[in-house]
């Protein structure tokens, strides 16, 4: 006769491991008992269990409640056992020793491999600001057994670097994603992808990029200078900028206070019916936590009864 087993049994942490051992005997041969032992190198054999043909399953106190026979129907030549709720410490070499008569004893070894799926974590880097050089956007760490694979999935251009730390029964892998921040990256997803044989599918953690920036400011409303004449209603100036975080707007007049009746509504400056008092230099001040910008325009309210030249100056300053 001969023993049939597996070279390696692979199981995910917490699952039950079936340790196979089947005696393929000749006609008339019988199995008296099957003893299972842990036989890691450098340590003496430690018995897990003994399956006795007449007196049933005996279990070592160290494995009480964790070793069972597979569910019926059972073949009397099948010495397989179930090791319940596999833990990392169960990983190692096991031996099945089958005592038969009249043929004697047979033994076979297998290796139990316990996969420990990773629980990845993603840590964003420092705040990203436009104008910075190569900056850490995020790091992703996953620990498991065997070592997991950590990669990145993104449309953003960047560079990655990985490092691994080996522990006694597992390995931790950390991958970093570096980029040169630009406003076009704002709102873009950066996804850490963790692969591992103990996972049914890759684990993905997505981080949305936030890049602080503030665009140059400009003022609209003076495109048609002929509209800025005495008596005109509904005249307005609008300050244009964009930023992350969204900026706030403030209007001032460089050559004095804002004239009475002029309304400030965020990025818009609304005028009452125009008079020559409204002529002057107006400044839009745009700011967010990252930066501030100014844009100034000169308003020249025309008297239609005068034939004097009409002139508007636009000046931008940062």
């Amino acid at each position: 006769g001969e023993l049939e087993t597996s070279d390696v049994v692979t199981v995910v942490l917490g699952q039950d491991a079936k340790l196979p051992c089947f005696y393929r005997g000749d006609s008339g041969e019988q199995v008296g008992q099957v003893a299972w032992a842990r036989v890691d190198a450098g340590e003496g054999a430690q018995e897990l269990a003994l399956l006795h043909s007449k007196y049933g399953l005996h279990v070592s106190p160290a494995y009480e409640g964790r070793v069972e026979q597979p569910p019926p129907p059972r073949n009397p030549l099948d010495g397989s056992v179930l090791l319940r709720n596999a833990v990392q410490a169960d990983e190692g070499e096991y031996e099945c020793r089958v005592s038969t008569f009249p043929a004697g004893s047979f033994q076979a070894r297998l290796r139990l491999r316990v996969l420990v799926p990773p629980l990845p974590s993603l840590n964003p880097g420092p705040a990203l600001e436009e104008g910075q050089g190569l900056t850490l956007a995020a790091s992703c760490t996953a620990e498991g057994s065997p070592a997991p694979s950590v990669t990145w999935d993104t449309e953003v251009k960047g560079t990655t670097s990985s490092r691994s730390f080996k522990h006694s029964r597992s390995a931790a892998v950390t991958s970093e994603f570096h980029l040169v921040p630009s406003r076009s990256m704002n709102g873009q997803p950066l996804t850490c992808v963790v692969s591992h044989p103990g996972l049914l599918q890759d684990q993905r953690i997505t981080h949305i990029l936030h890049v602080s920036f503030l665009a140059e400011a400009s003022v609209r409303g003076l495109e048609d200078q002929n509209l800025w004449h005495i008596g005109r209603e509904g005249a307005m100036l609008k300050c244009l900028s964009e930023g992350q975080p969204p900026p706030s707007y403030n209007w001032t007049r460089l050559d004095g206070p804002l004239p009475s009746g002029v309304r400030v509504d965020g990025d818009t400056l609304g005028f009452p019916p125009l008079t020559t008092e409204h002529s002057g230099i107006y400044v839009c001040h745009v700011s967010n936590e990252f930066s501030s910008r100014d844009s100034q325009v000169t308003v020249d309210v025309l008297d239609p009864q005068e034939d004097s030249g009409k002139q508007v100056d636009l000046v931008s300053a940062s």
């Epitope: 054999a45 018995e47 269990a49 003994l50 006795h52 007449k54 005996h58 279990v59 070592s60 106190p61």
Partner: nanobody, 118 residues
Framework: EVQLVESGGGLVQPGGSLRLSCAAS????????MGWFRQAPAKQRELVTS???????RYADSVKGRFTISRDVAKNTVDLQMNSLRAEDTAVYYC????????????WGQGTQVTVSS
């Protein structure tokens, strides 16, 4: 041939404890399982617990959590610690040894009486 000698029986109150011991001599190299059987009056002899040379154990459901078997292979002894004893544990307890050649218990001690009564 294997000779088995038990000791430690007696009278004990319900809820009490007793420890039985058994020493083996003779052809001890052939011993595989060692165990304890019991036989109450007018009942069949039943296997209470058994232990392999490697220390794997089996208990009858009726004694699980109350009885503990231990074996010293070097000294050729097997002990049975009995706690939380009940009236239904009253019986003659027999130490037994199983031969590696036959795979059944073929060596027996003379038996020791355990009586649980108030």
């Amino acid at each position: 041939e294997v000779q088995l000698v038990e000791s430690g029986g007696g009278l004990v109150q319900p809820g009490g404890s007793l420890r039985l011991s058994c020493a083996a001599s003779g052809s001890i190299s052939s011993i595989n399982l060692m165990g304890w059987f019991r036989q109450a009056p007018a009942k069949q002899r039943e296997l209470v617990t058994s232990i392999s040379p490697g220390g794997s154990v089996r208990y009858a459901d009726s004694v699980k959590g109350r009885f503990t078997i231990s074996r010293d292979v070097a000294k050729n002894t097997v002990d049975l610690q009995m706690n939380s004893l009940r009236a239904e544990d009253t019986a003659v307890y027999y130490c037994a040894a199983e031969s590696e050649r036959t795979y059944y218990f073929d060596s027996w001690g003379q038996g020791t009486q355990v009586t649980v009564s108030s």
